[in-house]
Amino acid sequence: DAAQPAASEVEKTACPSGKKAREIDESLIFYKKWELEACVDAALLATQMDRVNAIPFTYEQLDVLKHKLDELYPQGYPESVIQHLGYLFLKMSPEDIRKWNVTSLETLKALLEVNKGHEMSPQVATLIDRFVKGRGQLDKDTLDTLTAFYPGYLCSLSPEELSSVPPSSIWAVRPQDLDTCDPRQLDVLYPKARLAFQNMNGSEYFVKIQSFLGGAPTEDLKALSQQNVSMDLATFMKLRTDAVLPLTVAEVQKLLGPHVEGLKAEERHRPVRDWILRQRQDDLDTLGLGLQGTRGSHHHHHHEFRHDSGLNDIFEAQKIEWHE
């Protein structure tokens, strides 16, 4: 950022006659920094904050206005001021924001709007942290708002933080929101998603659950293989290796449907590579893809179910008909 004198360095000079601001309006854009300091009352500024954003104040004029608010509210701004900060929010430091108590989702939206189109700044991260902690959990409306502004938000949370996400909030999650999630995060999110979507019919269920499957256990993948889901290779490649290894050739063939041919292109990459090495060559040959596994005919299984799955029951109860 440009080097500039701190607002506190603006000389404390008397306001020239006739220049005392009676309201926050456009005429103030022609005031020098020292005139703003001298002629704009901080209390007036606080009560008319909603006007500031509509007026094209310069970068350095905004520094002065921030300084005035800081002097008026040394312990932190009240929410009535915060919700109308507009572009002044860009001037706030994480230290400033830690003094705030933001409880209204509307306030959060207003401030995120200011930063729209930019990466998540330390200021925004601090604001979100303060807001979520104040709420106690990441409820659906908040998650909806945050992922709308920052699709990668969910994946920036630790597994511990994700554990506070209620299953109902999962409805707000879009596939692109999970693009940067690692397996540990998906391990936490998958059971919540399965719970959230459990009453959907089969084909709709798969569409919704697909982006969470990186956290699915073997048992759930086996259940899906019975439902003609035609999982694409991109989704398959994101599955947990330990969940894929126990699957039989027949199960993988059913899981992928017409996409099974894509295994050849991925045979050197995990989890396909590791899965191939676990299969009998005879079984692999049934796919007709020229996949080279181990020559032996013995098939080892190491079941590592981390989740107790009720997926078979769901499908059975709903008597789902799957259509490709």
């Epitope: 440009a2 080097a3 500039q4 309006d25 456009e26 854009i29 022609f30 020098k32 006007r51 509509a54 007026i55 094209p56 104040f57 310069t58 970068y59 350095e60 004029q61 905004l62 572009y87 002044l88 860009l90 001037k91």
Partner: antibody
Framework: QVQLVQSGAEVRAPGASVKISCKAS????????IHWVRQAPGQGLEWMGI????????AYAQKFQGRVTMTRDTSTSTVYMELSSLRSDDTAMYYC???????????????WGQGTLVTVSS | DIQMTQSPPTLSASVGDRVTITCRAS??????LAWYQQKPGKAPKLLIY???SLASGVPSRFSGSGSGAEFTLTISSLQPDDFATYYC?????????FGGGTKVDIK
Amino acid sequence: QVQLVQSGAEVRAPGASVKISCKASGFTFRGYYIHWVRQAPGQGLEWMGIINPSGGSRAYAQKFQGRVTMTRDTSTSTVYMELSSLRSDDTAMYYCARTASCGGDCYYLDYWGQGTLVTVSS
Amino acid sequence: DIQMTQSPPTLSASVGDRVTITCRASENVNIWLAWYQQKPGKAPKLLIYKSSSLASGVPSRFSGSGSGAEFTLTISSLQPDDFATYYCQQYQSYPLTFGGGTKVDIK
């Protein structure tokens, strides 16, 4: 693509008024400020004022105060600039241009209209 | 108001030349300075903003530098398309003000 399309050339007698339009397209009208800048024949650029299409707030350079009025119509994404009490030295090309609505660090004029020539002559 | 003074007013140069234009402000404008190119009968076009940031679609032969009260626009290797008039503009404070322009013509 971003476009600012201005109304056509105007000829006015001294003392009359002229109203020029600037129609915006290709961007969110309410997220930008619209400035008016003029250029007399063979001369440099002179800033006249600014309008916020979102709230309608406006500010005029002191030189034009009392003679200029900037308005907007959000339904058609159009901004207007009216200059009254015209004199011969108001003969110039008048441009509208936009700047992003921001924290003050972006008041450079990134897109300009094609200009409207106003000739003041008796 | 902040006065912006450009020099030289006119500059004669040849294709391939390195060209430098100077802009001085009557007071500190920090880095809040833009440069524009204008061709006859056309509207100005943004080249540089925030003293040194290249506007979208502008060739990299254009560069800007400076802060405070003194700024320069440099064209590293003048091309036929670059013969035009160049203006600086400060946006440190209102009213926004422009330099008087520098006309770059063919030597």
